[in-house]
Interface confidence: low
């Protein structure tokens, strides 16, 4: 129903703590350069205003839309043009154009330093002094670096963070309690970020219907006992929630997500037998738990998919009458039978089925034409299955770091024009798929691998869009989301690339590398590896392995030397010479 004051309505629904957290996230995602203190001041002003509207919905300005209220706040920030350049032009526009303009200026790769975690003692001190401010800093720092982070999920991660600190700061050895736990939260949050960005990309580039198709497939896999009507209702509601979050309407998004969780828990009987554990949890944990709940047991008596979609004499009639429903039903029926497929694969199959019906239903004898459609799915299914097998075998042989290096070589050959930092980031992320997915049971590997790779490649596309340099990447990023991963996999060495000339300084290292954390050392070595491939795109695996082993040996030797600086300055040039010779 309509409310006199939208801001009062959301404040009442969400409660002060979540309301303030979401407003802070919203401001941090829009204005990514502002400090925490600047945003905290705005949040307090908005919250105070919301409270006046709760007390009296007819008070001045309480009837204004949230976009108007938030936009006016952002546009009142001093020195907006100096700090944000053309984003300030958004403030000359009226709603809804102003909000659209803010959205277009969100930066997926802001030039902010990496979020450094303070050491345990310092963290615990500031957490104990003021837990609210501490968590506010966390929300601000994550949100500004990830401007499309799913806001209600970020509140969940902040809650996790809070619980870990409460527990570990009471222990004697704070460091060894905090580090693994916070690393775990960070890893999950980063995966959540790329997954949500993919959803927003789907929404932005291909509209709500594309996202809804994704949701139907995903929900049908998870809830195979729910009927099509139920799945569609859930998919529709989930689409609305994601549309709101992707569009910056974070209060509405969080409120609607809570409503959806409530609906699911009230209707477990028609959705899934696996929801009870999630439904017993408090709100943020409940919604998070539902989003990754295990698949329900598939009904035992499902008829063969061919009955309704190939053998039925009315296939073309049914398709012509209600294309969207018929294809939706196909996607639902196929997905609920295949929890072992990725959503991307299921959408490719649905697309193939649609193309087949479009072609065949226009012919003289449609059944003869579409009769082989399920057999034609085979190559589409085999391709990602082979991808998983090949890559998981390689991961098991090389381990995560070696696997990342193999991917880095492969992708640098496919798109050598892409900047080395982007290639290294992408390869490191793509390489994590091994640790994340290859250790899972066989039937869970494919969905894990392909849907994760698709999300990472979406980030590659977003970064490349800002400064397009590779025709290969442009080609793969221009197609539909579900075709991206197969397109990237099929790319080979870019023959148009003119190799980079060999620069000794690129491969010159100093003793400061010895004190870097392991992760940073790996990045330095992987940066050198990418540069080697850019110099010799057709170098063999053997040649590259020789050079990288030599490089590792060099680092090991010099970092153990009594006089590190001398070792680096004398052995470094020798290493460079050996590298050139090995690649000649």
């Amino acid at each position: 129903e309509a409310h006199k004051s939208e801001i009062a309505h959301r404040y009442n629904d969400l409660g002060e703590q979540h309301f303030k957290g979401l407003v802070l996230i919203a401001f941090s995602q829009y204005l990514q350069k502002c400090s925490y203190d600047e945003h905290a001041k705005l949040v307090q002003e908005v919250t105070d205003f919301a409270k006046t509207c709760v007390a009296d919905e007819s008070a001045a300005n309480c009837d204004k839309s949230l976009h108007t209220l938030f936009g006016d706040k952002l546009c009142a920030i001093p020195n907006l043009r100096e700090n944000y350049g053309e984003l300030a032009d958004c403030c000359t526009k009226q709603e809804p154009e102003r909000n659209e303009c803010f959205l277009q200026h969100k930066d997926d790769n802001p030039s902010l330093p990496p979020f450094e975690r303070p050491e345990a003692e310092a963290m615990c001190t500031s957490f104990k002094e003021n837990p609210t401010t501490f968590m506010g800093h966390y929300l601000h720092e994550v949100a500004r670096r990830h401007p499309y982070f799913y806001a209600p999920e970020l509140l969940y991660y902040a809650e996790q963070y809070n619980e870990i600190l409460t527990q570990c700061c009471a222990e004697a050895d704070k460091e060894s309690c905090l580090t693994p736990k916070l690393d775990g939260v960070k890893e999950k949050a980063l995966v959540s970020s790329v997954r949500q960005r993919m959803k927003c990309s789907s929404m932005q580039k291909f509209g709500e219907r594309a996202f809804k198709a994704w949701a139907v497939a995903r929900l049908s896999q998870t809830f195979p006992n729910a009927d099509f009507a139920e799945i569609t209702k859930l998919a529709t509601d989930l689409t609305k929630v994601n549309k709101e979050c992707c569009h910056g309407d974070l209060l509405e998004c969080a409120d609607d997500r809570a409503e959806l969780a409530k609906y699911m828990c009230e209707n477990q009987a028609t959705i899934s037998s696996k929801l009870q554990t999630c439904c017993d949890k408090p709100l943020l944990k409940k919604a998070h738990c539902l989003s990754e709940v295990e698949h329900d047991t598939m009904p035992a008596d499902l008829p063969a998919i061919a009955a309704d979609f190939v053998e039925d004499q009315e296939v073309c009639k049914n398709y012509a009458e209600a294309k969207d429903v018929f294809l939706g039903t196909f996607l639902y029926e196929y997905s609920r039978r295949h929890p072992d497929y990725s959503v991307s694969l299921l959408l490719r199959l649905a697309k193939k089925y649609e193309a087949t019906l479009e072609k065949c239903c226009a012919e003289a004898n449609p059944p003869a034409c579409y009769g082989t459609v399920l057999a034609e799915f085979q190559p589409l299914v085999e391709e990602p299955k082979n991808l998983v097998k090949t890559n998981c075998d390689l991961y098991e042989k090389l381990g995560e770091y070696g696997f990342q290096n193999a991917i880095l070589v492969r992708y640098t050959q496919k798109a050598p024009q892409v900047s080395t930092p982007t290639l290294v980031e992408a390869a490191r992320n793509l390489g994590r798929v091994g640790t994340k997915c290859c250790t899972l049971p066989e039937d869970q590997r494919l969905p894990c691998v392909e849907d994760y790779l698709s999300a990472i490649l979406n980030r590659v596309c977003l970064l490349h869009e800002k400064t397009p340099v590779s025709e290969h990447v442009t080609k793969c990023c221009s197609g539909s989301l579900v075709e991206r991963r197969p397109c990237f996999s099929a790319l080979t060495v870019d023959e148009t690339y003119v190799p980079k000339e060999f620069k000794a300084e690129t491969f010159t290292f100093h003793s400061d590398i010895c004190t870097l954390p392991e992760k940073e050392k790996q990045i330095k070595k992987q940066t050198a590896l990418a540069e080697l491939v850019k110099h010799k795109p057709k170098a063999t695996a053997e040649q590259l392995k020789t050079v990288m082993d030599d490089f590792a040996q060099f680092l090991d030797t010099c970092c153990k030397a009594a006089d590190k600086d001398t070792c680096f300055s004398t052995e470094g040039p020798n290493l460079v010479t050996r590298c050139k010779d090995a690649l000649a």
């Epitope: 219907r209 009507a229 569609t232 529709t236 609305k240 009458e321 209600a322 429903v325």
Partner: nanobody
């Protein structure tokens, strides 16, 4: 301008029947799925039934299955709701709605709405 005009509402005894009609104008009727929603006093609007563009697919809420029947006449640009075995809890304003795309007819998917017709079922 798109218009959906409902008619056929009124007062009826429990156990009785009514037939609601919804006449559409200003849109290509056969390109739209149609639905009936209802809103009882003090309650949220709920979906009751919907029908696909050609009439081959229907959706019924559990509360009306076996009692209500939806049909459409694309030549007449009209959708009908036959309501039998009416109960006092069926009392509500009934709204006709049109959707360019149809899945199962959640309110969010419908593009055009009528003004509603009141159905009162007395016990």
């Amino acid at each position: 301008e798109v218009q959906l005009v409902e008619s056929g509402g009124g007062l009826v005894q429990a156990g009785g029947s009514l037939r609601l009609s919804c006449a559409a104008s200003g849109l290509t009727f056969s390109s739209y799925a149609m639905g009936w929603f209802r809103q009882a006093p003090g309650k949220e609007r709920e979906r009751v039934v919907s029908i696909s563009r050609g009439g081959g697919y229907t959706y019924y809420a559990d509360s009306v299955k076996g009692r209500f029947t939806i049909s459409r006449d694309n030549a007449e640009n009209t959708v009908y709701l036959q309501m039998n075995s009416l109960k006092p809890e069926d009392t509500a304003v009934y709204y006709c709605a049109a959707a360019r795309y149809w899945a199962t007819g959640s309110e969010y998917e419908f593009d055009y709405w009528g003004q509603g017709t009141l159905v009162t079922v007395s016990s």
